[in-house]
């Protein structure tokens, strides 16, 4: 019962993070006009993956695709990629976790399967869920750079001929939807790979004794017990596997500033 | 076609509020701000600020703020302004604008401050 | 605040001449972000609201005759009339449509000679 609901809650977990992950990368919002220098800004620029938008004093908001692929910088293009690769092999991951829950039955599948399925899931998902926070961490880290890039531009240059604020950027909404969204994908995964152990048979290896009609001789196979009791060396149908939930990636989060102009 | 309908001049003595509607056709009533100007006779355009009918947000002049305030209702796609404490320089023609670079505009209402 | 400035305050163009009017703002209205500059340019009526003829410095609105142009970039901006006729008889408005408050220039009132 309990694996069950660790596989379920896992696969739900997993599938809330995915739509994350995937409305994150559809969102424009992934850096914002920074408005500490600039508060009363009638123009408000904000930017995507995709696409650049501005939203002017009528409430009209344009927004202009870039229709560039060779002339984006190359951590963009880094960014979009670990997006795709996360929303790609969490869908399998998804597709591959129907098959193997507990709770459906699909014709004469052994539990071996499911957890092998289950498993293979969870893996994706944790890479999955890596490959986004990887992607939006890699975003954030280029927008504090350029943040402090424009900060130092904007006390150096012009020598104050001509008035013109240098737009800078900062964290958008899509960041946080798409660190807690990879976080749950993660967490979904571990949950999954859990779930798995859980799942595999438990093996029993009594072996028969073999009879030999020519002979007196009765040949016993020793080591039937190993199985059950869960320890000693077992390659037949349980994976060794590491739980792969590593923690060294930990998010640290900024303070954000809602203005609404 | 886009329109903006604006109520009809107002009489008023010193001290007293004044409240004037803007009634909205033709676009989406919450897609755009709505922005009211001030123009005394004789004088140029004064921005007093806007409404956001999506979101009730609002922005004002400093100059205003504390005297104008703006509101909207969806159902009747109508934005409001009412301007209290009024004072003799207050009289003058109150436009309601809308669009890219307001190119909407409401006929005007003349209001009066006179003892 | 950002302040307008007009000029000049009034011009007087035969018919048929070209008529240009400045408008200088305090600040930079280039907004970096979609490199264009927000500044409008109205013509207004006796009696009447005003019409809108330019915005993002030389953006024309449907329906403006194409004698009206706009030019400028950053602080100093022009609105070109390149062959005045009766109707074109107005006040003209720039305003700055970048930060808020928005401000509007003085007016200039064209005359024909």
């Known amino acids: 019962m309990a694996v069950t609901a660790c596989q379920g809650l896992g696969f739900v977990v997993s599938l809330i993070g995915i739509a994350g992950i995937i409305a994150a990368t559809c969102m424009d919002q992934w850096s914002t006009q920074d408005l500490y220098n600039n508060p009363v800004t009638a123009v408000f620029n904000y930017q995507g993956l995709w696409r650049s938008c501005v939203r002017e004093s009528s409430g009209f908001t344009e927004c202009r695709g870039y229709f560039t692929l060779l002339g984006l910088p190359a951590m963009l293009q880094a960014v979009r990629a670990l997006m795709i690769v996360g929303i790609v092999l969490g869908a399998i991951g998804l597709l591959v976790s129907i098959f193997a829950l507990k709770c459906i039955r699909i014709g004469s599948m052994e539990d071996s399967a499911k957890a092998n399925m289950t498993l293979t899931s969870g893996i994706m998902f944790i890479v999955s869920g890596l490959c986004a926070i990887a992607g939006v961490s890699v975003f954030a880290n280029m927008l504090v750079t350029n943040f402090w890039m424009s900060t130092a531009n904007m006390y150096t240059g012009m020598g104050g001929m001509v008035q013109t604020v240098q737009t800078r950027y900062t964290f958008g909404a899509a960041l946080f939807v798409g660190w807690v969204a990879g976080g749950l994908t993660l967490i979904g995964g571990v949950m999954m790979c859990i779930a798995c152990r859980g799942l595999a048979p438990e093996e029993t290896n009594y072996k028969a004794v073999s009879y030999h009609a020519s002979g007196h001789s009765v040949a016993y196979k020793p080591g039937g017990f190993k199985a059950s009791t869960g320890f000693g060396s077992n390659t037949k149908n349980k994976k060794i596997y590491d739980g792969g939930a590593r923690t060294e990636d930990e998010v640290q989060s900024y303070p954000s500033k809602h203005d609404y102009v | 076609q886009v329109q903006l309908v604006q109520s009809g001049a107002e009489v008023k003595k010193p001290g007293a509020s004044v409240k004037m509607s803007c009634k909205a056709s033709?676009?989406?009533?919450?897609?755009?701000?709505i922005h009211w100007v001030k123009q005394a006779p004789g004088q140029g355009l004064e921005w007093i600020g806007y409404?956001?009918?999506?979101?009730?947000?609002?922005n004002y002049n400093l100059k205003f703020k504390d005297r104008a305030t703006l509101t909207s209702d969806t159902s009747s796609s109508t934005a409001y302004m009412e301007l209290s404490r009024l004072r003799s320089d207050d009289t003058a023609v109150y436009f309601c604008a809308t669009g890219r670079g307001f190119a909407y505009w409401g006929q005007g209402t003349l209001v009066t401050v006179s003892s | 605040d950002i302040v307008m400035t007009q000029s000049p305050d009034s011009l007087a163009v035969s018919l048929g001449e070209r008529a240009t009017i400045n408008c200088k703002s305090s600040?930079?209205?280039?907004?970096?972000?979609?490199?264009?500059?927000?500044l409008i340019w109205y013509q207004q009526k006796p009696g009447q609201p005003p019409k809108l003829l330019i915005y993002r410095a030389s953006t024309r609105d449907s329906g403006v005759p194409d004698r009206f142009s706009g030019s400028g970039s950053g602080t100093d901006f022009t609105l070109t009339i390149s062959s005045l006729q009766a109707e074109d008889v107005a006040v003209y408005y720039c305003q700055n449509d970048y930060s808020y408050p928005l401000t509007f220039g003085g007016g200039t009132k064209l005359e024909i000679k």
């Open positions: 033709g676009f989406t009533f919450t897609s755009y701000n």
């Open positions: 409404i956001s009918p999506g979101n009730g947000g609002s």
């Open positions: 600040q930079s209205l280039f907004n970096s972000g979609n490199q264009k500059n927000y």
